[in-house]
């Protein structure tokens, strides 16, 4: 029933957590398909997600090659069916994404408390060092491997019987805190990159409390 025009993509948005990085856009295609291209400022435009009817494209494999580079993507709209291309001289329409620097912008995923161990009035709390999709020498790097000392963790802890929270910070994945003997404590951690201006903090980890399976209690 007549021809329509191809429509340029819009609302191009980077969705990235712990370097898993997906470009999303609108609209849902009608009689058109999309191809995404990604480039660094000095590099070639590499086509990905060829002729897709999806409105997202996983670009993780490209950005993990160098997470400190700044990337730009563009989404091409190609006619597919009863449509006319509105690009000039047969050139397809495309829309550019915002720039994206993974190291500075990827969201920090929700951390997990791996374990806690009490020895007398000290508790050692260990944060799981989450694996990322960044590779070096064919092995996947952890979040700590990638960020080094730029990444800190904040521990929130409180007595199970009260609501007053204390905090501790570490630039490793372990905390050693003082606790009152005979009291049970609850813990939650948050990943933080203090040097960042955006996406500085993760969401808080699930709460873990002493007296539950995750921890170990040793009275000395």
């Amino acid at each position: 029933s007549g021809t329509t025009n191809t429509v340029a993509a819009y609302n191009l948005t980077w969705k990235s957590t712990n370097f898993k990085t997906i470009l999303e856009w609108e609209p849902k295609p009608v009689n058109q398909v999309y191809t995404v291209q990604i480039s660094t400022k000095s590099g070639d435009w590499k086509s990905k997600c060829f002729y897709t009817t999806d409105t997202e494209c996983d670009l993780t494999d490209e950005i993990v090659k160098d997470v400190k580079q700044t990337y730009l993507a563009r989404v091409f709209s190609y006619p597919a069916g009863n449509v006319e291309s509105t690009g000039s001289a047969g050139e397809p329409l495309y829309e550019n994404s915002p720039e994206f620097t993974p190291y500075l912008e990827t969201n920090l995923g929700q951390p997990t408390i791996q374990s806690f161990e009490q020895v007398g009035t000290k508790v050692n709390v260990t944060v799981e060092d989450e694996r990322t999709l960044v590779r070096r020498n064919n092995t996947f790097l952890s979040l700590r491997d990638v960020f080094g000392k730029d990444l800190i963790y904040t521990l929130y802890y409180w007595k199970s019987s009260s609501s007053g929270k204390k905090t501790a910070k570490t630039n490793t994945n372990e905390f050693l805190i003082d606790v009152d003997k005979g009291e049970n404590y609850c813990f939650s951690v948050q990943a933080v990159i203090p040097s960042r201006t955006v996406n500085r903090k993760s969401t808080d980890s699930p709460v873990e409390c002493m007296g539950q399976e995750k921890g170990e209690f040793r009275e000395i």
């Epitope: 398909v33 191809t35 590099g43 070639d44 435009w45 590499k46 086509s47 060829f50 002729y51 009817t53 494999d61 090659k65 091409f76 190609y78 006619p79 597919a80 069916g81 009863n82 449509v83 291309s85 047969g90 397809p92």
Partner: antibody, heavy 117, light 106 residues
């Protein structure tokens, strides 16, 4: 002017190795995926796979996964298709073709490979 | 993989007649191309994105279809149109071609 020039015809025996080439000119060689297409005598076209010259990422048709290897030499703007051990069923015309959208359509002239004892 | 079945395998027609070539996909396809190939030559893009004529292709050619059924139509055959036509899907990897339809002079 965009051109893809392929290496000449080859006659080989079963079990022998072979590397054929496709040299690109007139465009930024590293910016475009390069396809390889097989056409057996009197038969249709088969997409073998493609390679991105800038970083050598490949997308291979699983049918050819253990049979052929794609590679590039960026310094001389050349893509390669190679076999370590040829079979009679590898007898075919092989085309390289730049991956393009729409009317852009650039193919090599084809390389004939004959495998016979 | 998506299997493309072209029919008929051979179409024997006279110049001036209408030719209808079919391409049926084993699952839904959103991006279909058609190529023309003449003996001793590399294939050449003819129709892209289901219905878009490649540069220099005469208006007597048209492409249509959606989902799993696609058609290339030549409204009035000219002598230079006699060749083999292949459909190709680029919706999912591996990209695949149909077996081809040979349009020959009756």
């Amino acid at each position: 002017e965009v051109q893809l020039v392929q290496s000449g015809a080859e006659v080989k025996k079963p079990g022998e190795s072979l590397k054929i080439s496709c040299k690109g000119s007139g465009y930024s060689f590293t910016s475009y995926w390069m396809n390889w297409v097989k056409q057996m005598p009197g038969k249709g076209l088969e997409w073998m796979g493609m390679i991105y010259p800038a970083d050598s990422e490949t997308r291979l048709n699983q049918k050819f996964k253990d049979k052929a290897t794609l590679s590039v030499d960026k310094s001389i703007s050349t893509a390669y298709l190679q076999w370590s051990s040829l079979k009679a069923s590898d007898t075919a015309m092989y085309y390289c073709a730049r991956e393009d959208y729409g009317s852009s359509d650039y193919w090599g002239q084809g390389t004939t490979v004959t495998v016979s004892s | 993989e998506i299997v493309l079945t072209q029919s008929p395998a051979t179409l024997s027609l006279s110049p001036g007649e209408r030719a209808t070539l079919s391409c049926s996909a084993s699952s839904s396809v959103s991006y279909m191309n058609w190529y023309q190939q003449k003996p001793g030559q590399a294939p050449r893009i003819w129709i892209y994105g289901i219905s878009n004529l490649a540069s220099g292709i005469p208006a007597r050619f048209s492409g249509s279809g959606s989902g799993t059924d696609f058609t290339l139509t030549i409204s009035s055959l000219e002598p230079e149109d006699f060749a083999v036509y292949y459909c190709q899907q680029k919706s999912s990897f591996p990209w695949t071609f149909g077996g081809g339809t040979k349009v020959e002079i009756k």
